[in-house]
């Protein structure tokens, strides 16, 4: 028989991690693997039908995506949907597929809301999600003894689909659930000079452990401002929520692993400021299959999709689509073996959830509500060389922090700064306000 | 032939102005009129198919509505859609119908965004819209010499679909377009006591001409607070944006036309405070056909829909659906007479736009972009009796303010207060800061 998978992803714009130019080759490789394995869907052909989640400007759209989904449903009555990745595009599509009782598989849609499976029934996320970032940060706080206060700053940038809003939303809500902790959050516009003044006034009053979701340039700017204002590494720690590791990539941007470097006359200060910085990214899979997969992926992208794929963590997304599609096909195969049909979305989905799977991204665990356990890396600066390197990894499945041997977190005082200063944010602790003259009564 | 109109409105919840229990009888009356008129769609049967815009809780939903629209499109391939009325429900449906090139007719969806016909192609609004309120207010400002500054306060109330946000958005944007004027706007939560403190501090610094969109109770509270703070009718004017005239209705609420009355021991003060208040509502049609229509509407609602319809401006909405549907059928009839088909959405829509029509709501003009010109009434207090009455009507078609004979606006000083106080909001006018001691050099 024919198994039809309807794809709703950006078909023209190649800049999204889940653009078809990136995911298409991964799907091709997955389907080639299915063909090569006699145990997967024997006697069946898997075919993909495409719809675009972009509007005429090539931007993800909450109108184009559901319209594409509706058209594909009408014309092809697919067994499953692949994508969308963008939050605003995925939301209406996921609600539609839930209504139709058709499985939706994505390695995007990382926002908190998609974890609510009453609304997004049969949606499986084979990629990372922002609430899982919260699990990592909660574990980090427990390890470092920060159980009282944190501050989260997130950038608004026109046209970036409120990436940082959704990231901080997932992080904030999950950290608050996991720890009994006060978390303040503040939005700023990266291109609005007055906002930096406001942040500068807010940071000392609201946090010592500060998470920042922004572009690499804006993070570096904030670090320079912090240095200037004396918010130094002894008392403060700044985490750059740079999940795809853009600031660590080199290329047109900063030098590889030297996210403070720009050649703008401020590098000396920036390097000093970055002593108080750490960077959080997704973890790069380190299994040999992933490297082999990347080689094939890049080759196929160039040959068949006329697209040159850069290196970087962004490639974990197509890899996760690949693994998710294989997991789906595995679940369909089992459902058929148990007398079910390809239209039995509930049954197929249940076989994907609460399940482990060895994929090109390594060991993959889908939790009991259909979301992948996500691994993260924490990068810190080597004070000798100024280069950043991974010092700690987080295993989402075991929820453990695993130190990289021979490396440790760099703290100017030798230990992490407290999350609330000794005398409180406004020097409100009475013990700190005593007259320093001792008087004899 | 068969002409199918797909209805997407709240089918269970009767509280919306566009609930099916209210609009259904109006549609029945319109279709009865079509049957009775041999010149309208001769030889054709008009049938309605229903889909609900509500979720399981009976609340308008941006998921349920487009899903209903999609299901109706698949099953019935309708020639047109009627509804939705709620902003969040109408938005995705209107974008879908635009994509399908199917006309959408509503007497709801009053928000500014629906005026952008690039996005909402073939959407005709036969009811009032908030940008038209801006046309009225701009005309009022011109008449009263307020061309510099205004303040708009709008209430957030859980579950009211951000009615006041959308109302003030349309008003604000249109007033700003029509006049070169500074307009500040501020949201407040009706149930948050601290917000009233903030408003009290803000009003003297930001406005003398103040528009307030809120429940009648919250408006009365603000008027009492204003009186208490000495923001009196000589210097201030407060407009209650009470478009359906809830505060004027009596019944369970305030006494008819005495919106200040509650019997809570504060009526004397409230009456005094309301000397500085005026109320803006939609205009009640005053043509005899409307009264006759209302009689039939209420009867049909009770008999066939088991719903008892109250009096009030809210009934202008079903009446507008009635007139809009007749206008649509008139346009279809003409299109067919010119060799077109019922599926020719563009042609049919063009025949509805930039057109006048005599309906049960009186003279109805659809502008060149498919939105009805809207009439408003301005109510003011009779200082003798304390009762409010209409002193001024606004004709949306002619864009004229028409005084009600024998009545005039009540100003404590005999003239409208200036929109910026004589010495500026912060007493910044140097002429007001002169030393009052004259010194001889």
């Amino acid at each position: 028989g024919n198994l039809t998978v309807a794809v709703v992803l950006p078909l023209a714009n190649t800049s999204y991690p889940w653009s078809w130019a990136r995911v298409g080759p991964a799907v091709e490789l997955a389907l080639a693997r299915v063909k090569a394995r006699p145990d997967l869907l024997p006697g069946w052909t898997v075919r993909t039908v495409l719809g675009s989640s972009e509007n005429a400007l090539g931007v993800c759209s909450d109108t184009a995506a559901p319209l594409a989904a509706v058209d594909l449903k009408w014309e092809h009555n697919p067994a499953a949907f692949l994508g969308p990745g963008c939050v605003y595009a995925a939301a209406p599509v996921g609600r539609f597929t839930a209504h139709w009782r058709v499985p939706l598989l994505t390695a995007g849609a990382p926002a908190l809301g998609f974890g609510v499976k009453d609304e997004y029934a049969l949606t499986t996320r084979a990629g990372p999600s922002y609430a899982k970032l919260g699990d990592f940060v909660a574990a980090l706080h427990r390890r470092l003894g920060w159980e009282r206060q944190a501050l989260m700053l997130y950038a608004y940038r026109p046209g970036d689909e409120e990436h940082c809003f959704f990231l901080v939303e997932g992080l904030f809500m999950r950290v608050r659930d996991r720890l009994n902790i006060t978390v303040d959050h503040l939005e700023f516009a990266e291109d609005d000079l007055s906002h930096y003044t406001r942040l500068l006034r807010t940071m000392p009053r609201k946090g010592r452990v500060i998470y920042i979701c922004s572009s690499p340039d804006a993070f570096r700017t904030l670090m320079l401002l912090a240095l200037e204002a004396g918010l130094c590494g002894e008392d403060y720690v700044f985490f750059h929520l740079d999940i795809f590791g853009q600031s660590l990539q080199g290329g047109q941007g900063p030098a590889p692993r030297r996210p403070w470097e720009r050649g703008d006359g401020q590098d000396v200060s920036a390097r000093q400021a970055f002593q108080a910085a750490k960077i959080i990214t997704y973890k790069e899979p380190d299994n040999p299959e992933y490297l082999e997969f990347l080689k094939q992926l890049k080759h196929l992208a160039r040959e068949q999709f006329n697209f040159t794929m850069e290196d970087g963590l962004v490639n974990t997304i197509p890899a996760s689509f690949h693994d998710g599609l294989l997991l789906y096909i595995q679940a369909v195969t089992e459902t058929l073996a148990h007398g079910g049909t390809v239209t039995d979305g509930e049954n197929i989905t249940q076989r994907m959830w609460n399940r482990s799977f060895q994929g090109v991204t390594g060991y993959l665990k889908i939790d009991s509500s259909g979301d992948r356990e996500t691994d993260f890396s924490l990068w810190d600066m080597d004070p000798e060389t100024g280069a950043f390197r991974v010092v700690l990894n987080y295993n989402g499945t075991s929820q453990e922090l695993v130190a990289v041997s021979g490396r440790k977190l760099n703290w100017p005082l030798g230990y992490p700064p407290p999350d609330i200063p000794k005398c409180g944010f406004d020097n409100e602790d009475p013990a700190c306000n005593q007259d320093h003259l001792s008087t004899l009564e | 032939g068969n002409l199918t109109v797909a209805v997407v409105l709240p089918l269970a919840n009767t509280s919306y102005p566009w609930s099916w229990a209210r609009v259904g009888p109006a549609v029945e009356l319109a279709l009865a009129r079509v049957k009775a008129r041999p010149d309208l769609l001769p030889g054709w049967t008009v049938r309605t198919v229903l889909g609900s815009s509500e979720n399981a809780l009976g609340v308008c939903s941006d998921t349920a509505a487009p899903l209903a629209a999609v299901d109706l499109k698949w099953e019935h391939n309708p020639a047109a859609f009627l509804g939705p009325g709620c902003v969040y429900a109408a938005a995705p449906v209107g974008r879908f119908t635009a994509h399908w090139r199917v006309p959408l007719l509503t007497a709801g969806a009053p928000a500014l965004g629906f005026g952008v016909k690039d996005e909402y192609a073939l959407t005709t609004r036969a009811g009032p819209s908030y940008a038209k309120l801006g046309d009225f207010v701009a005309a009022l400002h011109r008449r009263l010499g307020w061309e510099r500054q205004a303040l708009m306060l709008y209430a957030y109330r859980p579950g009211d679909e951000e009615h006041c946000f959308f109302l003030v958005e349309g008003l604000f944007m249109r007033v700003r377009d029509r006049l070169n004027i500074t307009v500040d706007h501020l949201e407040f939560a009706e149930d948050d006591l601290s917000h009233y403190t903030r408003l009290l501090r803000t009003m003297p610094r930001k406005g003398r001409v103040i528009y307030i969109c809120s429940s009648p109770d919250a408006f009365r509270t603000l008027m009492l607070l204003a009186l208490e703070a000495g923001l009196c009718g000589e210097d201030y004017v407060f407009f209650h944006l009470d478009i359906f005239g809830q505060s004027l209705q009596g019944g369970q609420g305030p006494a008819p036309r005495r919106p200040w009355e509650r019997g809570d021991g504060q009526d004397v003060s409230a009456r005094q405070a309301f000397q500085a208040a005026k109320i803006i509502t939609y205009k009640e049609p005053d043509n005899p056909e409307y009264l006759e229509f209302l009689k039939q509407l209420k009867h049909l609602a009770r008999e066939q829909f088991n719903f008892t319809m109250e009096d009030g401006l809210v009934n202008t909405i079903p009446a507008s659906f009635h007139d809009g549907l007749l206008l649509y059928i008139q346009a279809v009839t003409e299109t067919l007479a010119h060799g077109g088909t019922v599926t020719d959405g563009e042609n049919i829509t063009q025949r509805m736009w930039n057109r006048s029509f005599q309906g049960v709501t009186g003279y109805l003009k659809i502008d060149s972009s498919g939105d009805r010109e809207t009439d408003f009434s301005l109510w003011d207090m009779d200082p003798e009796t304390g009762a409010f009455r209409v002193v001024l009507n606004y004709n949306g078609t002619s864009q004229e303010l028409v005084a009600v004979s024998g009545r005039k606006l009540n100003w404590p000083l005999g003239y409208p207060p200036p929109d910026i106080p004589k010495c500026g909001f912060d007493n910044e006018d140097p002429a007001c800061n002169q030393d009052h001691l004259s010194t001889l050099e």
């Epitope: 930096y196 200037e228 401020q266 | -």
Partner: antibody, heavy 123, light 107 residues
Framework: EVQLVESGGGLVQPGRSLRLSCAAS????????MHWVRQAPGKGLEWVSG????????GYADSVKGRFTMSRDNAKNSLYLQMNSLRPEDTALYYC????????????????WGQGTMVTVSS | DIQMTQSPSSLSASVGDKVTITCRAS??????LNWYQQKPGKAPKVLIS???SLQSGVPSRFSGSGSGTDFTLTISSLQPEDFAVFYC?????????FGQGTKVEIK
């Protein structure tokens, strides 16, 4: 009204010193970085020095580094440029300018300028 | 240091003409480029910041574009009051640097 008024210019011999001042009014002085820009007679604009809101970063053009010192007194809404070891090529109209941002780490343009004070270095 | 090179150094144009001035940076400065106008005997005035943001009060006939190393200031229809010297300036790095200026004269 937002304004900057420079003072302290004049005729000075090579090798001597001069101190320029700039008085700011009409805006929150300690919310902005400030700059000195000069213009030699008949020539273009040359950035001399810039200072962040709290003096945390101070930058100089190579041509004045080691000779000029920029400072600010936020309590007095004042900006200063101490010019030592003056040279004939330092002859110029010296403008004080307000940055649109709080720091030199930002990218603010100079949105308010004074009318300038003339410094002439000649023997 | 980042060098800024403007071209042309001067130009003659008539009222109503479209005028284009270019500015090149010696390294990538993103969009951190500002344009100033200076009239004789007056202090400079900022027209455009971050390559394309028109400052309030500046007529809409002025526009800016570009990113990286190449930038343009365009005056769509030259008015009599526009005859002046125009400077570009980078705000990417320290030291800040100006272009050498472009003098726009009446033809």
């Amino acid at each position: 009204e937002v304004q900057l008024v420079e003072s302290g210019g004049g005729l000075v011999q090579p090798g001597r010193s001069l101190r320029l001042s700039c008085a700011a009014s009409g805006f929150t002085f300690d919310d902005y970085a400030m700059h000195w820009v000069r213009q030699a007679p008949g020539k273009g604009l040359e950035w001399v020095s810039g200072i962040s809101w709290n003096s945390g970063t101070i930058g100089y053009a190579d041509s004045v580094k080691g000779r000029f010192t920029m400072s600010r007194d936020n309590a007095k809404n004042s900006l200063y440029l101490q010019m030592n070891s003056l040279r004939p090529e330092d002859t110029a109209l010296y403008y004080c300018a307000k940055d649109m941002g709080v720091s030199l780490a930002l990218w603010g343009a100079f949105d308010i300028w004074g009318q300038g004070t003339m410094v002439t270095v000649s023997s | 240091d980042i060098q800024m090179t403007q071209s042309p150094s001067s130009l003659s144009a008539s009222v109503g003409d479209k005028v284009t001035i270019t500015c090149r940076a010696s390294q990538n400065i993103r969009t951190y480029l500002n344009w100033y106008q200076q009239k004789p005997g007056k202090a400079p005035k900022v027209l455009i910041s971050t390559a394309s943001s028109l400052q309030s009060g500046v007529p809409s006939r002025f526009s800016g574009s570009g990113s990286g190393t190449d930038f343009t200031l365009t005056i769509s229809s030259l008015q009599p009051e526009d005859f002046a010297v125009f400077y570009c300036q980078q705000s990417f790095g320290i030291p800040r640097t100006f272009g050498q200026g472009t003098k726009v004269e009446i033809k």
